[in-house]
Interface confidence: medium
């Protein structure tokens, strides 16, 4: 196998919901503009998932700062990092399995799954990237745990991978995202998606740090950041190298398969904001 | 070249079962989810569901659901629609159909097979 | 479930002729929407994704645009090997459902 088909799968104890950014400036990354001063201020890190402090040069920038670490939080983070995921002792579905689907105000269309409450089963629906509710999940399986009744009226716990012996066939599988890791590459290799502000459609590659992968953009042909590759080879080449996942516990865990493409997406993929 | 190949058609009593086979080549199986989608005679596209066959995740149309069950076989590149109670409604064309991720839509369909359900 | 609407179910024209044919979804899909062409006896064929992105093969003669509910497939020059079923898919959100179809005929 090459640099390039290798997989890094780690198991943790601890599992990130998919972001819902309350305000799509959340999103944008700390930008200390063209000016000198040094102004301690406060931006949204979506990575961390926290507010945090930069310095700011005292003009221009965007609007991920504030005065005050409290009004970033206030602006920005919402209380969703206790989701319940449900087991078979709770029968209770969470309130925002029956809101509708919300494909938000963004425009950077990925695929998602949400809980239709008519049908009484989980679809596929299209997530601008921004915004929308928690009626919003990376995976079948997850919004199947969380939201489906089970066979005998209680939730679905989880699915285990299954190989039937028969027909080597595959019955649905929970999949974990990765959740720590430490980087050593550059700095903008840990930057989001940038599509930026012009009208093209760019094939183009950018590193994606939370699973350590290089995935396909459509860039603007403007703007944008460094984190912007022509090709697949030169984004793993820049960036790859420099990721290192970890467990909690400190161990490093490495199986090695074939990349399989999938239509979902991982939840940091959505912060990429397309003609807004 | 892609290549969809369904299988398994023919005429069915009403009440009984189908299992209809979509073998598929030309490119890496695990790379895109297959579809099913079948046209009744002189009708429109209704689309029955889909799979993923990394993990047999599927999605159906509610319409078909505690009916049609989807399966995949890895080993054999192939994808099968198990169809339950069969009604004279039922009978059309069964095209299985390559789901391409990035465009968000069907990009290659097999020729169909044609389901007849007639006593 | 989203209603997907042709309202031609059969349109008339002659070769070299521009023709438009439309698809109204019951709700806003977004712009995801693609268009398929079928001919007698065979399987469809995807032509355009994502409301206008032409797939790979199909002539330039093919544009798709709309946005919300309003969606439009435009021949700027029809051609005899044009003449066929188009339908319209919405892919924003499942159960995916299709137009009911326009058949695209020689005056």
């Known amino acids: 196998d090459s640099e390039e088909d290798e997989e890094h799968t780690i198991i943790t104890d601890t599992e990130l919901p998919p972001l819902k950014l309350m305000h799509s400036f959340c999103a944008f990354k700390a930008d200390d503009g063209p000016c000198k001063a040094i102004m301690k201020r406060f931006f949204f890190n979506i990575f961390t998932r926290q507010c945090e402090e930069f310095i700011y040069g005292g003009c221009e920038g965007n609007q991920n700062r504030f005065e005050s670490l409290e009004e970033c939080k206030k602006m920005c983070t919402r209380d969703n990092a206790n989701r319940i995921i449900k087991t078979t002792l709770q029968q209770e579905k969470p309130d925002f399995c029956f809101l509708e689907e919300d494909p938000g105000i963004c425009r950077g269309y990925i695929t998602r799954y949400f809980y239709n409450n008519q049908t009484k089963q989980c679809e596929r629906f299209k997530y601008g990237g921004c915004l929308g509710n928690m009626n919003n999940f990376e995976t079948l399986e997850e919004c199947k745990n969380i939201c489906e009744d089970g066979p005998n009226g209680f939730q679905v716990d989880n699915y285990g991978t299954q190989l039937n012996a028969v027909n080597n066939s595959l019955t649905p599988q929970s999949t974990k995202v990765p959740s720590l890791f430490e980087f050593h590459g550059p700095s903008w290799c840990l930057t989001p998606a940038d599509r930026g502000l012009c009208r093209a459609n760019e094939n183009r590659f950018y590193y994606n740090s939370v699973i350590g992968k290089c995935r396909p953009f459509k860039y603007s042909g403007c703007g944008g950041n460094e984190n912007n590759f022509t090709s697949k080879q030169e984004c793993l080449r820049a960036c790859k190298k420099g990721f290192i996942q970890r467990i909690s516990k400190g161990g490093l865990i490495k199986t090695k398969r074939k990349r399989k493409k999938q239509r979902v997406k991982i939840a940091y993929e959505e912060i990429f904001v397309k003609n807004m | 070249e892609v290549q969809l190949v369904e299988s398994g058609g023919g005429l069915v009593q009403p009440g009984g079962s189908l299992r209809l086979s979509c073998a598929a080549s030309?490119?890496?199986?695990?790379?895109?989810?297959l579809d099913w989608v079948r046209q009744a005679p002189g009708k429109g596209l209704e689309w029955v569901g889909d799979?993923?066959?990394?993990?047999?995740?599927?999605l159906y149309n509610q319409k078909f659901k505690g009916r049609a069950t989807i399966s995949v076989d890895q080993a054999k590149n192939s994808a099968y629609l198990q169809m339950n109670s069969l009604r004279a409604e039922d009978t059309a064309v069964y095209y299985c159909?390559?789901?391409?991720?990035?465009?968000?839509?069907?990009?290659?369909w097999g020729q169909g097979t044609l389901v007849t359900v007639s006593s | 479930d989203i209603v997907m609407t042709q309202s031609h179910k059969f349109m008339s024209t002659s070769v070299g002729d521009r023709v438009s044919i439309t698809c109204k979804a019951s709700q806003d899909v977004h712009t995801a929407v693609a268009w398929y062409q079928q001919k007698p006896g065979q399987s469809p064929r995807l032509l355009i994704y994502w409301a206008s992105t032409r797939h790979t093969g199909v002539p330039d003669r093919f544009t798709g645009c709309g946005s919300g509910t309003d969606y439009t497939l435009t021949i700027s020059s029809v051609q005899a090997e044009d003449l066929a079923l188009y339908y319209c898919q919405q892919h924003y959100t499942t159960p995916y459902t299709f137009g009911g179809g326009t058949k695209l005929e020689m005056k």
């Open positions: 799979i993923n066959p990394i993990n047999g995740a599927t």
């Open positions: 159909a390559r789901y391409y991720g990035d465009y968000d839509a069907m990009d290659y």
């Open positions: 030309g490119y890496t199986f695990t790379d895109y989810n």
